[in-house]
Interface confidence: low
């Protein structure tokens, strides 16, 4: 499933993420659209040999287990394939997980480089929430 | 329960190319990796490559670049592998797989003869 | 590539008799390799996956060992039923590769 951004922002706020650990809204939407460009069924490889699955590319090294990716953790104890989903409940529980490890967002490399410092609320704005 | 079916065997001239099937039933097809496995006598088994069928992402051995391409159609459930440019060499059962990393579902087999 | 060498490439046994069949790995894989046996004409089927789990079906008489480099899947009095090819393949990185598989035989 591909997300409008509003409809996004509203799943999003939904499912708790508003000011989870104290990042906006914005921020959520705004790693989604750089990281997936809101395509819940987006998978990258990367070089180590994981893989980074679904809205908010999260990586089978250390939060799912896709049965390929040597020395996973699997934090989130979850299949990756359940990333994919289009229902993001998933996704959002595991980003929770993820936000509350230490280093907040900056987890995210397309929210460090993309999201971090600019303004964020432009990716809600205009969005009935 | 978990199944895939392949298409039946092929006869095909050198030079030509070929499509075959492998229609998956009992699980979420997007969710799973598809792999392409080749079996010659003598030569063992190959992995061809895979495709995540729900994102259309696709990975290639080395050693079919330009010779396997892989699509699927998620409204039937089914992968596609089209070989082309065939030579004798590509003569072989093709078989289709579940990638979890090991293959516990596997496809029946697809035998490709390239013969003139 | 990882390349898994498989010995012995036959093994002629007699029904009642327990087994080793050997995988190396060319570089450490840790325990991401799987097991299958595979009968003429039929497709490979899952035995052991990830060095030693048993897969779902599989007799008690199946088991698999090892870590890094040294794999081994053992056969506890084996039946008529387990002849045929066997295969090990490695999950640990890219591309997949399988061993050249080793012919279980009737003596």
């Known amino acids: 499933k591909v997300f409008g951004r509003c409809e996004l922002a509203a799943a999003m706020k939904r499912h708790g993420l508003d000011n989870y650990r104290g990042y906006s809204l914005g921020n959520w939407v705004c790693a989604a659209k750089f990281e997936s460009n809101f395509n819940t069924q987006a998978t990258n490889r990367n070089t180590d040999g994981s893989t980074d699955y679904g809205i908010l590319q999260i990586n089978s090294r250390w939060w799912c287990n896709d049965g390929r990716t040597p020395g996973s953790r699997n934090l989130c104890n979850i299949p990756c394939s359940a990333l994919l989903s289009s229902d993001i409940t998933a996704s959002v529980n595991c980003a929770k997980k993820i936000v509350s490890d230490g280093n907040g967002m900056n987890a995210w490399v397309a929210w460090r480089n993309r999201c971090k410092g600019t303004d964020v609320q432009a990716w809600i704005r205009g969005c009935r929430l | 329960q978990v199944q895939l079916q392949e298409s039946g065997a092929e006869v095909m001239k050198p030079g030509a190319s070929v499509k075959i099937s492998c229609k998956a039933t009992g699980y979420t097809f997007t969710t799973y990796w598809i792999e392409w496995v080749k079996q010659r006598p003598g030569h063992g088994l190959e992995w061809i490559g895979e495709?995540?069928?729900?994102?259309?992402?696709?990975y290639y051995n080395e050693k079919f670049k330009g010779k396997a391409t892989f699509t699927a159609d998620t409204s039937s459930n089914t992968a596609y592998m089209q070989l082309s440019s065939l030579t004798s060499e590509d003569s072989a059962v093709y078989y289709c797989?579940?990638?979890?990393?090991?293959?516990?579902?596997w496809g029946q087999g697809t035998t490709l003869t390239v013969s003139s | 590539d990882i390349e898994l060498t498989q010995s012995p490439a036959t093994l002629s046994v007699t029904p009642g008799d327990s087994v080793s069949l050997s995988c190396r790995a060319s570089q450490s894989i840790s325990n991401n390799l799987h097991w299958y046996q595979q009968k003429p004409h039929e497709s490979p089927r899952l035995l052991i996956k990830?060095?030693?789990q048993r897969a779902s079906g599989i007799p008690s008489r199946f088991s698999g060992s090892g870590s890094g480099t040294d794999f081994t899947l053992s056969i506890n009095s084996v039946e008529t039923e387990d002849f045929g090819m066997y295969f090990c393949q490695q999950s640990n990185s890219w591309p997949r590769t399988f061993g050249g598989g080793t012919k279980l035989e009737i003596k």
């Open positions: 990830y060095a030693s």
């Open positions: 797989a579940r990638g979890d990393g090991h293959y516990c579902y």
């Open positions: 495709i995540l069928p729900g994102s259309g992402s696709t």
